[in-house]
Amino acid sequence: LPAQVAFTPYAPEPGSTCRLREYYDQTAQMCCSKCSPGQHAKVFCTKTSDTVCDSCEDSTYTQLWNWVPECLSCGSRCSSDQVETQACTREQNRICTCRPGWYCALSKQEGCRLCAPLRKCRPGFGVARPGTETSDVVCKPCAPGTFSNTTSSTDICRPHQICNVVAIPGNASMDAVCTSTSPTRSMAPGAVHLPQPVSTRSQHTQPTPEPSTAPSTSFLLPMGPSPPAEGSTGD
């Protein structure tokens, strides 16, 4: 004979557990139905009546099958430096994601609580470590023989051009200036960028001491409220 299908609520066999989407109610000592995502338990089960579920109210949610007496509150609205990548519905919490050009300074289980603008390295400093989702850019002073003349979240220090005859020697924030005769090695105009988030160009290669011969026209997107153009002392 096939086993009888028990309908909730029912008393489980000793040593057995309730089925999927059921829970054991300690008070009723019965297996009872859980409420579906988007609902909560309005009335708990008894020995003779099953769980009564009700829809979550506006701005509240339940993501899982549950028997909670109240739905969870959705997180606060996203700030201007964030994007709502997942809306608050009866079945899911709101998720806020930092806009391009920002990183997550204070994470939540899902999304970000607090965003901060990516640091921009000032002239004389280059990017030592690029920014990520949850970490800021790290700047470093340009070593002798290299320079950066930009305020940027992506530019690394690049070598001075080598001149046959130097008109003005280069320093950390300026390239060498050659006399009218061609330099031995002509450096490309524009900045060298890390193959990194936050650059608007996407075909970057790993940075090398030598820039490519093609000029770069990368720029940092002014996403949302513009991050302050912070100088950095490389800390």
Epitope: V83, T85, Q86, Q92, I95, T97, C98, R99, P100, W102, Y103, C104, S107, E110, G111, C112, C115, G131, T132, E133, T134, P197, V198, S202
Partner: nanobody, 118 residues
């Protein structure tokens, strides 16, 4: 690292349609959430649409709801923005962006120009 390249922009008359593509390389695109942003001359960038990295759910700016559709093809490592009933005010450079875990859009492309004429 993820590199993103947008395409499909162009000049279209009001009421027309365009389909933007965002080709990703360098990492498994399916692991990333994807969003589209746009920036009109002299204006701050504006969020357009997003697709969740874990459950594929989508979210749209009010200004494009019902007209734009975001989607992705993980096999082709490409995301899309289908734009219908275009309006003059949709004119902007459109950027796709990627987020590894939904905390920040830490990668984006160079953008593609969309111009809607009356």
């Amino acid at each position: 690292e993820v590199q993103l390249v947008e395409s499909g922009g162009g000049l279209v008359q009001a009421g027309g349609s365009l389909r933007l593509s965002c080709a990703a390389s360098g990492r498994t695109f399916s692991d990333y959430g994807m969003g589209w942003f746009r920036q009109a001359p002299g204006k701050d960038s504006e969020f357009v649409a997003a697709i969740n990295w874990s459950n594929g759910r989508t979210n749209y700016a009010d200004s494009v709801k019902g007209r734009f559709t975001i989607s992705r093809d993980n096999a082709k490592n490409t995301g899309y923005l289908e734009m219908n009933s275009l309006k003059v005010e949709d004119t902007a450079v459109y950027y796709c962006a990627a987020t590894p875990s939904g905390k920040a859009y830490s990668y984006w492309g160079q953008g593609t120009q969309v111009t809607v004429s009356s």
